[in-house]
């Protein structure tokens, strides 16, 4: 004969556990129901009466089978330099993630606890790795041969345009200026000499909590804070 | 001129592990990246990771992310790979380079050639 | 980790056009990827041909071009030479690591 199904509440077997979505009462001494998600124990089960639940109140929420007394409080709205991307639900928390532009200096369980604004590397410096949702910007010197001329948290440096006759010629913030004739983005090989790189480093800048107005992409969502790279700027 | 001068052959027993050196000259070694990426017999480039002497920040790629070591020794302007738990897959040409996708800064060493065999 | 396929060989007719391509096991190849060309002729140094999917580096002869195309990074060779004749890498960068692909042997016949 198959075992009979026991309902809750019921005293399980000695030396058992109470099934999947149940809790051992140690008052009641009885397996009783667990609350859904979204719910809270409003009145806890006796040796005859089970769990009796009750549905969140706004801004609070329980995300898991539960029997908690009160559901939790959602967490405060989220700040100007973050975007809500879960809303506060009777199951689930809100969570702030950082905007645009922003990384996240300090995360907590879900979501982000401090944003900070990705730093920008000012003209002369590139990005060497592209800031992502937990890590900024680093910024390098540009190469020989290379160049920024704009300050920015996504741009990297790029080759100076060849000249046909170079009326000016470029640095490391600057592009080639040609002279009249079409300039391209070619060399023929071995038709430059590069000089030596730079090796001397900028004072430390502090990036200023201003949001950022480089251009921002789905791929600045970037490792931990981390002091300002030399060639990092605020606006 | 710039240099990358590697430390030469290794041979090494499965289990071990190995210790190679990139010595750079003609830069401030503290400017630019240094990658490491290997060369097995025969197969594609596969890419280590790379460091950031400036301050030792260090990026793997995923497969190397429990095995390999990078560091750098900015007074003498040298980087460093180890790798450990060596196995024979492991046998290859171990290249340091300042090649970065984002540098445009393009030179190699010329190549640590390990061997890993019981 | 992503995984980046290229063809393992292509044959251009010298002064011909060619175009190597790089997938992504991850889905469209984008700017973010930051393709990049590696260049390496046999008991030669590598040399990096092309960066941030398009530009070429300092010294690289303009019938080298990077692109975007169809989802995949490509560079295109126009007007092959019979020095281009060499194996070439791409490298994708995935948010903290570069990926390279396994390589096409181009032979100019």
């Known amino acids: 004969l198959p075992a009979q199904v026991a309902f809750t509440p019921y005293a399980p077997e000695p030396g058992s556990t109470c099934r999947l979505r149940e809790y051992y009462d140690q008052t009641a001494q009885m397996c009783c129901s667990k609350c859904s998600p979204g719910q809270h124990a409003k009145v806890f089960c006796t040796k005859t009466s089970d769990t009796v639940c009750d549905s969140c109140e706004d801004s609070t929420y329980t995300q898991l089978w539960n029997w908690v007394p009160e559901c939790l409080s959602c967490g405060s709205r989220c700040s100007s330099d973050q975007v809500e991307t879960q809303a506060c639900t009777r199951e689930q928390n809100r969570i702030c993630t950082c905007r645009p532009g922003w990384y996240c200096a300090l995360s907590k369980q879900e979501g982000c606890r401090l944003c900070a604004p990705l730093r920008k590397c000012r003209p002369g410096f590139g990005v060497a790795r592209p800031g992502t949702e937990t890590s900024d910007v680093v910024c390098k010197p540009c190469a020989p041969g290379t160049f920024s001329n704009t300050t920015s948290s996504t741009d990297i440096c790029r080759p100076h345009q060849i000249c046909n006759v170079v009326a000016i010629p470029g640095n490391a913030s600057m592009d080639a200026v040609c002279t009249s004739t079409s300039p391209t983005r070619s060399m023929a090989p071995g038709a430059v000499h590069l000089p030596q790189p730079v090796s001397t480093r900028s004072q430390h800048t502090q990036p200023t909590p201003e949001p950022s107005t480089a251009p921002s992409t789905s791929f600045l969502l970037p490792m931990g804070p981390s002091p300002p790279a030399e060639g990092s700027t605020g606006d | 001129q710039v240099q990358l001068v590697q430390s030469g052959a290794e041979v090494k027993k499965p289990g071990a592990s190995v210790k190679v050196s990139c010595k750079v000259s003609g830069f401030n070694i503290k400017d630019f990246y240094i990658h490491w990426v290997r060369q097995a017999p025969g197969q594609g480039l596969e890419w280590i990771g790379r460091?950031?002497?400036?301050?030792?920040?260090?990026e793997y790629a995923p497969n190397f992310q429990d095995r390999a070591t990078m560091t750098t020794d900015t007074s003498t302007s040298t980087a460093y790979l180890e790798l450990s738990s060596l196995r024979s897959e492991d046998t290859a040409v171990y290249y340091c380079?300042?090649?970065?996708?984002?540098?445009?800064?393009?030179?190699w060493g010329q190549g640590t050639t390990v061997t890993v065999s019981s | 980790q992503a995984v980046v396929t290229q063809e393992p060989s292509l044959t251009v007719s010298p002064g011909g056009t060619v175009t190597l391509t790089c997938r992504s096991s991850?889905?469209?190849?984008?700017?973010?990827?930051?393709a990049n060309w590696v260049q390496q002729k046999p008991g030669q140094a590598f040399r990096g041909l092309i960066g941030?999917?398009?530009d070429r580096a300092p010294g690289v002869p303009a019938r080298f071009s990077g692109s975007l195309l169809g989802g995949k990074a490509a560079l295109t060779l126009s007007g092959a030479q019979p020095e281009d004749e060499a194996e070439y890498y791409c490298a994708l960068w995935y948010r903290n690591h570069w990926v390279f692909g396994g390589g096409t042997k181009l032979t100019v016949l």
């Open positions: 460091v950031d002497p400036e301050d030792g920040n260090t």
């Open positions: 941030g999917t398009n």
């Open positions: 991850t889905g469209p190849v984008t700017t973010n990827n930051y």
């Open positions: 380079s300042t090649w970065d996708g984002f540098s445009y800064f393009d030179y």
